[in-house]
């Protein structure tokens, strides 16, 4: 079960979806993507304290063991829980074509 959404570290410090603007050059895509020329990349960024947005029992255990053995067990990571699809117009060997990527943009985030 996904646990609490209250962030003990203060606003915007805990795991959440954030939008980062990136050019094709920033992403290293300029040689194969034609459009969009700038991507609003939704990413999962932030800390995963206590039981914040724990994705499952494994994440809860990880949090507990991290408190006990921080040198051995890493804290849970903020990762996408689901994705929004996005279409790219790309160059291929046979010409320009469309390709939809189902896992390019984070929709919402959790800790795992």
């Amino acid at each position: 079960a996904r646990n609490g959404d209250h962030c003990p570290l203060g606003p915007a410090a805990c795991c959440a979806a954030h939008t980062v603007r990136a050019s094709l050059e920033d992403l290293g895509w300029a040689d194969w993507v034609l459009s969009p020329r700038e991507v609003q990349v939704t990413m999962c960024i932030g800390a995963c304290p206590s039981q914040f947005r724990a994705a499952n029992m494994h994440a809860q255990i990880k949090t507990s063991l991290h408190r006990l053995k921080p040198d051995t067990v890493p804290a849970p990571c903020c990762v996408p829980a689901s994705y929004n699809p996005m279409v790219l117009i790309q160059k291929t060997d046979t010409g320009v074509s469309l390709q939809t990527y189902d896992d390019l943009l984070a929709k919402d985030c959790h800790c795992i």
């Epitope: 459009s35 117009i89 320009v96 939809t100």
Partner: antibody, heavy 117, light 106 residues
Framework: QVTLKESGPGILQPSQTLSLTCSFS??????????VGWIRQPSGKGLEWLAN???????YYNSALKSRLTLSKDTSNNQVFLKISSVDTADTATYFC??????????WGQGTLVTIS | QIVLTQSPAIMSASLGEEITLTCSAS?????MHWYQQKSGTSPKVLIY???NLASGVPSRFSGSGSGTFYSLTISSVEAEDAADYYC?????????FGGGTKLEIK
């Protein structure tokens, strides 16, 4: 495989409202960068862009016709709707809908002929 | 709005001939698309963003240009190229098409 199909009344009278439906398959308007555009073509003449509706419900209209155009979508049923109010004989044309990916009319419907008479 | 003027309005070409269709914009645009429309069918894209061939389009088609002047070249015209050709800009709304060039084969 992407397909689009336009449907409309065929014939209607001046001053009425033209209602067009674009039914599509093979893509989703939940996909970022995806939209549906409307273009019309009077017989024997060139193409005129009318409007686009996007995945995020942004709508853009041809400024010359904006006051008469209304766009909407039903994402779950893969349909887009265009209404043109107060039609006259100058609106007689074949109306196309097309899949728009960012800036590209990638796939087009076969078109539906609308006659104002 | 940006007005696109295509010339010539009608072009007649012989099989195997190289031809160039032009599109002039009333103000500068970043890129141009080119569409082909054969009689009784819907348009299809030939050139994406000035010079990129769309998937499945024969290599005899090519595009170039910048600013206010763009062109579409067919290096060796074939009978199946008889069609109307439209340039299209999306640099600013409203998106606009050129008036078209009708290519006839002698």
């Amino acid at each position: 495989q992407v397909t689009l199909k336009e449907s409309g009344p065929g014939i209607l009278q001046p001053s009425q409202t033209l209602s067009l439906t674009c039914s599509f398959s093979g893509f989703s308007l939940n996909t970022h960068g995806m939209g549906v555009g409307w273009i019309r073509q009077p017989s024997g003449k060139g193409l005129e862009w009318l409007a686009n509706i996007w995945w995020n419900d942004d709508k853009y209209y041809n400024s010359a016709l904006k006051s008469r155009l209304t766009l909407s979508k039903d994402t779950s049923n893969n349909q887009v709707f265009l209404k043109i109010s107060s039609v006259d004989t100058a609106d007689t044309a074949t109306y196309f809908c097309a899949q728009v990916a960012w800036d590209w009319f990638a796939y087009w419907g076969q078109g539906t002929l609308v006659t104002i008479s | 709005q940006i007005v696109l003027t295509q010339s010539p309005a009608i072009m007649s070409a012989s099989l195997g001939e190289e031809i160039t269709l032009t599109c002039s914009a009333s103000s500068s645009v970043r890129y141009m698309h080119w569409y082909q429309q054969k009689s009784g069918t819907s348009p299809k894209v030939l050139i994406y963003s000035t010079s990129n061939l769309a998937s499945g389009v024969p290599s005899r088609f090519s595009g170039s240009g910048s600013g206010t002047f763009y062109s579409l070249t067919i290096s060796s015209v074939e009978a199946e190229d008889a069609a109307d050709y439209y340039c299209h800009q999306w640099s600013s709304y409203p998106w606009t098409f050129g008036g078209g060039t009708k290519l006839e084969i002698k």
